[in-house]
Structures are given as C-alpha cells and as structure tokens.
Interface confidence: medium
C-alpha cells in the first residue's frame, strides 16, 4: 500500500546515545570515529505481503472513509462523522513518523482499505499486525480491526457495523473492562447461518496496555493446522485451538438432552429420608424454651434503680416561634442521664438471658439413606438434529479490506504500521522496522535490541 | 433425499421469452442461494447467475445482464430463471444448482453439489 | 475464447496417473478459489474438488486438486475406464463479477 519515503529524519539525542553505547561495544576499525546517526525511514516490507501501511506519506491516500449511515440510530447520531487523520504522535521522539490518528471522540468513526489482493484461508497462515497508541488514555472505546469478507456486495463508501467481517481483531475497553477480541464469523454449514466465535479472555493482565500511554503492537497468527497465537509486543498473551478454544464452541456437541424427556412423578431424588422407625424419647421436652434468666446472675453494685436512662434536656429553650396551638405542648428533647454515666447502669435491672441446657426443641426423627433413591434426574440424551462437524474452521470466509469501525469516548487514538501477511519473518521484520523503533525511541529498548535493530538495518540497509 | 426437479424441455421462437422452474426438496430451501448454468450443446458451462432465496437478492452474469431475472417462491421452496429476447445461440440445457451444504462461504459461488436434472430449452424459428 | 485455459485432451491408459492444467489470471484464480467438475455424457455436472483441494464426501481420493499462482490442476491417478468424461475447471473473477469455467478437457481412458 504505503510506498516508503526518502525523507531521512534523526531520531532525537536519547536514541542517539543509546546507539552511541552500542557502536562504542563493536571492535575499532581503522575508520576515523565519527558520530553514529539513526535514522527514521518508513518500513518496507520485505516480501509479499497483502496489505501494508505505515502513513508516512502523511495522506489518507487508499482509504475510504464511510459515507454510511448506521442502522437503528437516530439520525443525528447514526452518521459516520468522526474525524481522521494522519500525523505524528503529540509525543513522538520520531519526527516523521506518522500513523492513523482517531480524532474525535463521542462519534461513530469509519475508514476502510482494500488489500492488495483477498486473503484466501488455504495453505499458508494468516498473520494480522498493528500498532496502538491510546495517547490520552481510553476511558470506553476500542481501537480492533476488522477484515472484511470477501462478497460481491462490499463496497467500502458504505462501510458499517453491519459490513459482513470474517475476523474482528484488538483491543477494546469500557469502565474496568480491558479486552482484547480475536471473534471470527463461522457459516453454520447446516443452516448457511454465521455466528461469531469469540476466543477465550487472555489470562494476561490487560490494563497497561491501555493505561501507560505507550504504543503496543498487536498480532494476530492463526495457522491451517486451526491453532492460533495472539501476541502483544511480541509476547504470546493467549493462544488455542479453533476447535477447542473458542466460545460458542464451533461444532456442536453430538447429543442433547431430549426436550420432550419429562420426570416420571414418583421419580425419588431424595438421598436422605428421616427414619420411619424412629420413636421421640419419652423424656423429650419440645416446650422447654431455647433461653432463660441466668440465677446466677447479681445486679451489679452501685446500678441506680430509680435513675431514668433518659431525662429532659435542662438546657434546651423553647423555640420563639413554637405555637402551642398549633405544634402542642412543648417537651425538652431528651437526653442521655449524665448520672447514669458513672454507673455501672440505670432504670430497673433485668436478669440476663442464658441458653437453656435443658432446651431440645422440635424433635425430628434422624435421617437414614433412602433404600429408594433413584438418583438426580436427568433427560435422556438424543441424537442433536443440529449436530455438524466441522474440522477445518480455519477455512474462513476470504476477505479482501481491512476496516476500521469503531466509537470512543476518547480522542487521538493512534494507529500505526497495519501489515497482513502469510509469512512470520517478513512481518517480524516490519516490527523491528516500525514499532522496534518506537519502543527503543522510548528508552525502553531491552538491552540488545537496539543492537539487533542496527544489524538488521545492515543486513537490509 | 436432497434435490432439485426441474420444469420439462421449452421450444421457443426468437424474440420470446421462456422461464424455467426448479423445486427444491430435502433441504431448507430459505438457507442456500441458487444458482443457474447453462450449456450450449458442445460448448463449456456457463454462470447465469444466482438468488438468496432467504432474502431475495440477486446477482447475474454481465454476460446476460437485462436479460435475465431469477426469483424464487419459498411458500413452494421453487427458483425460477427467466431469459427474454431469445436468440439461437440460446439453445442449451439450463441448469438450477445448489451450493455445497458444507461451504459455509455460499456468498461466493463456484462448489455446486445439487444440480437439477438439466431443462433443454431449444431457440428456432 | 475462455477466460480459464485448459486443454482440450487428455488421455492415459488404467492404472496411470492424468494431471489436467487450468490456466487463469490475478483476477480469477490468482485472488479466488478454484473448483472443479466431472460431467459424463448426458447428465449434469459432479463437484469433484471444492477450494482448490477439498473432495466432497463420496468423491475419491484419487482425484486431488492443487493451485499455485494464477493456475491450477487436477489430478487423477489409479485411472479408470469410468473417469472418461470432460472435466472442467471454474474460479469467480472479480473483474467480470461472475464465474467463470474453462472449455473443458476430455479425459479418454484407452
């Protein structure tokens, strides 16, 4: 898609440091020392690939944006309005390098791009791969993909929710609901009807992806074998089996519970039933009550028995405004008896209650094991009607755009480096070029990679 | 048993129009498109075009484009293929044909597992 | 003229393995699937490969499918007097927006 620029733009002094200290680790060579300078240069894929943009041509040149209206929306709100750009981060450390900017927020955004050529699930895997900066935070919206079937119909100006896709894949959050979607659409092969897959949640922890301001690439790898892989920053954060791994399951099960199965009426479920040879004692008192006064029991000494626990307040006044006709006799609210404060109590003492030893209550007969249990009932199981195998879910519907169709409440999502690919190297490579270069720009390069990005730079200068 | 029956052989003059059915059975006909064939005696296959029978939409050859319609009664579970303006070179044996039940991407077509018996529509003045 | 090649002959004795070539463009099998039919004389077309390579239940595993490229071939080995037939070749193409078949290739078993 994205030709690669000319423009050659040095990265700011941090990076040239980082890249000073790892020149300085290589042998000396008879050359004359001079300062090492890197350079921002667009990526270029290296090999085929089916889609590629990196932006820095600086135009949304091979994008369409929407002229759709969503369905089911009132009108003011169910245009595609939301603005696009394509510019460089507010807080980039690499001047030139530009990417897909969301820009406003509260509105339905969508832009969409053909691919080279469609993507047919056959042979060879599919690798789907972006970059993610949510520059101001994301407090609900998402920021996925989605590749958009391959159908007659397609047409990219009118671009909607409802635009079949065959895969949706990324990141989306709301409130402290951090997701990362990878949903594919399977054609029931019974019923001709599709219904989205979703993968099981990432045992990783989601939230500084979206928190920490920095840019994340995403990757996507799901191979003819039906396996699949989902990587953030080049790390595995979930990964599976078409077949086994996805919600609803992608085939059904083989039987079903009958519908039409009803519990017999003396069907016994009871583990337990209380013994019906079991006799109440003769001494069993069932009406000796559970509590009584404590005998034992002494009123404490110094407990004021003709001390009220409450009494008027002596230094409440009756309100200028109260009206004895109309509001009643006036009282002194009342409060606690500061004499009963160094006391160990006031008014009249009670006993205090006690369990009662002697207390059985009703009495039960004992439970025995029910010599007619039959067990929980269940129905018996069936043949499904709508049982299908089908063991090659990776053999999806082809698709031939990518589209970007999103809301947030959060602006300047920025959006980089989209590559989709049938070859792992080719796309690593694109990451080095691109997002590597980003994260060492950072200062977060792990010790080495920086280095390895200078040999890759040698070896495909 | 899955299959589609056809309307029996047309002889038509130049200028007319013939429209051929095709009743599916064994199969819910509401969730496959149908698509129509024809060959022209010793000549390669030929795409007309196709229905969704759920909904109705169609798709026709540019080739034939103006004059062909297809349509379809679900009440009947029938797809019928109507081509106007005949001419000679219209005389083949038209086909109706189903999707392959386990290509879930009918949308796109090309894998017909269910043809019908083949209808001779023959053109001649 | 076709818009997919393929010869108009082939032939193999029993036993023998028969490869049958389909020749197209980009806009056909280069960006779509290929699929292709078994048609004896008098009766409608059989699916024999569907997605460049996959056989319908009931269909042998004699018969296999490859694409590579804008191309595409059908293969038949263990050759049987009942394969004679034409065999064709068909792939959507998106610059036409319809599908496409070849002219056909007779298979003779001799």
């Known amino acids: 898609h994205d030709g690669h620029d000319d423009d050659v733009i040095d990265i700011e002094d941090d990076l040239d440091d980082v890249i000073e200290e790892v020149e300085d680790s290589k042998p000396d060579t008879t050359a004359p020392p001079s300062s090492p300078k890197v350079t921002y240069k667009a990526p270029v894929p290296t090999g085929e690939v089916y889609f590629a943009d990196s932006f820095d041509r600086g135009t949304l040149s091979g994008w369409i944006l929407s002229k759709a209206k969503k369905d089911d929306t009132d009108d003011e709100i169910a245009k595609y309005d939301g603005k696009w750009e394509v510019e460089e981060m507010k807080e980039s450390k690499l001047p030139g390098d530009k990417g897909l900017v969301l820009m406003s927020r509260a509105k339905h955004h969508a832009i969409s791009a053909k691919l080279n050529k469609p993507f047919l699930f056959d042979t060879k895997p599919l690798i789907v791969q972006y970059e993610v900066n949510f520059q101001n935070g994301i407090e609900c919206g998402g920021a996925y993909v989605k590749l958009l079937s391959k159908t007659p119909e397609l047409n990219l100006d009118q671009f909607h929710d409802k635009t079949p896709y065959t895969i949706m894949f990324g990141p989306d959050k709301c409130g402290e609901d951090y997701k990362l979607h990878f949903i594919f659409r399977h054609k029931n092969p019974k019923t001709g009807i599709y219904e989205e897959k979703h993968a099981k949640r990432p045992d990783a922890d989601l939230k500084t992806y979206f928190t920490d301001k920095k840019t994340h690439l995403y990757t996507l790898i799901l191979n003819p074998d039906n396996s699949f892989e989902i990587l953030v920053d080049q790390s595995v954060v979930n990964s599976g089996n078409l077949l086994n791994d996805m919600t609803p399951p992608v085939n059904p099960s083989r039987e079903i519970e009958d519908p039409e199965d009803r519990k017999p009426e003396d069907w016994d479920e009871r583990p337990k039933i209380p013994d019906p040879e079991a006799v109440k004692p003769d001494d069993w008192d069932e009406d000796a009550p559970a509590k009584i006064p404590d005998e034992e029991a002494t009123k404490p000494e110094g407990w004021l028995d003709d001390e009220p626990e409450y009494v008027p307040d002596p230094d409440a006044e009756k309100p200028e405004d109260w009206d004895e006709d109309m509001d009643g006799e006036w009282e002194a609210p009342q409060i606690a008896n500061p004499r009963c404060e160094s006391a160990p109590g006031c008014g009249v003492w009670q006993r205090p209650v006690i369990d009662n030893p002697n207390y059985k209550g009703k009495w039960k007969p004992p439970m025995i094991d029910n010599p007619s249990y039959q067990g929980i009932w269940k129905p018996r199981k069936i043949p499904n009607p709508d049982f299908f195998e089908d063991l090659e879910p990776f053999r999806m519907t082809p698709f031939s755009a990518i589209g970007l169709e999103l809301w947030s409440m959060t602006s300047d999502i920025f959006f980089d480096n989209f590559i989709i690919c049938a070859d792992r190297r080719i796309v690593d490579d694109w990451a080095n070029d691109g997002w590597g270069l980003k994260k060492a720009a950072d200062g977060a390069a792990e010790p080495g990679v920086v280095g390895q990005m200078i040999e890759a730079a040698e070896e495909r200068p | 048993e899955v299959q589609l029956v056809q309307s029996g052989a047309e002889v038509k003059k130049p200028g007319a129009s013939v429209k051929v059915s095709c009743k599916a059975s064994?199969?819910?006909?509401?969730?496959?498109?149908m698509h129509w064939v024809r060959q022209a005696p010793g000549q390669r296959l030929e795409w007309m075009g196709w229905?969704?029978?759920?909904?109705?939409?169609?798709k026709y050859s540019q080739k034939f484009q103006g004059r062909v319609t297809i349509t379809r009664d679900t009440s009947a579970s029938t797809a019928y293929m109507e081509l106007s303006s005949l001419r000679s070179e219209d005389t083949a044996v038209y086909y109706c044909?189903?999707?392959?039940?386990?290509?879930?991407?009918?949308?796109?077509?090309?894998?017909?597992?269910?043809w019908g018996q083949g209808t001779t529509v023959t053109v001649s003045s | 003229q076709s818009v997919l090649t393929q010869p108009p002959s082939a032939s193999g004795t029993p036993g023998q393995r028969v490869t049958i070539s389909c020749s197209g463009s980009?806009?056909?099998?280069?960006?779509?699937?290929v699929y292709w039919y078994q048609q004896l004389p008098g009766t409608a077309p059989k699916l024999l490969i569907y997605?460049?390579?996959q056989r319908p239940s009931g269909v042998p595993d004699r018969f296999s499918g490859s694409k590579s490229g804008t191309s595409a071939s059908l293969a038949l080995s263990g050759l049987r007097s009942e394969d004679e037939a034409d065999y064709y070749c068909?792939?959507?193409?998106?610059?036409?927006?319809?599908?496409?078949f070849g002219g056909g290739t007779k298979l003779t078993v001799l």
């Open positions: 044909a189903r999707v392959l039940h386990v290509l879930r991407y009918f949308d796109w077509p090309g894998a017909f597992d269910i």
């Open positions: 064994g199969y819910t006909f509401t969730s496959y498109a």
């Open positions: 229905i969704n029978a759920g909904n109705g939409n169609t």
């Open positions: 980009s806009s056909n099998i280069g960006t779509n699937y």
């Open positions: 997605i460049n390579d």
């Open positions: 068909a792939a959507w193409d998106d610059s036409l927006s319809g599908l496409v």
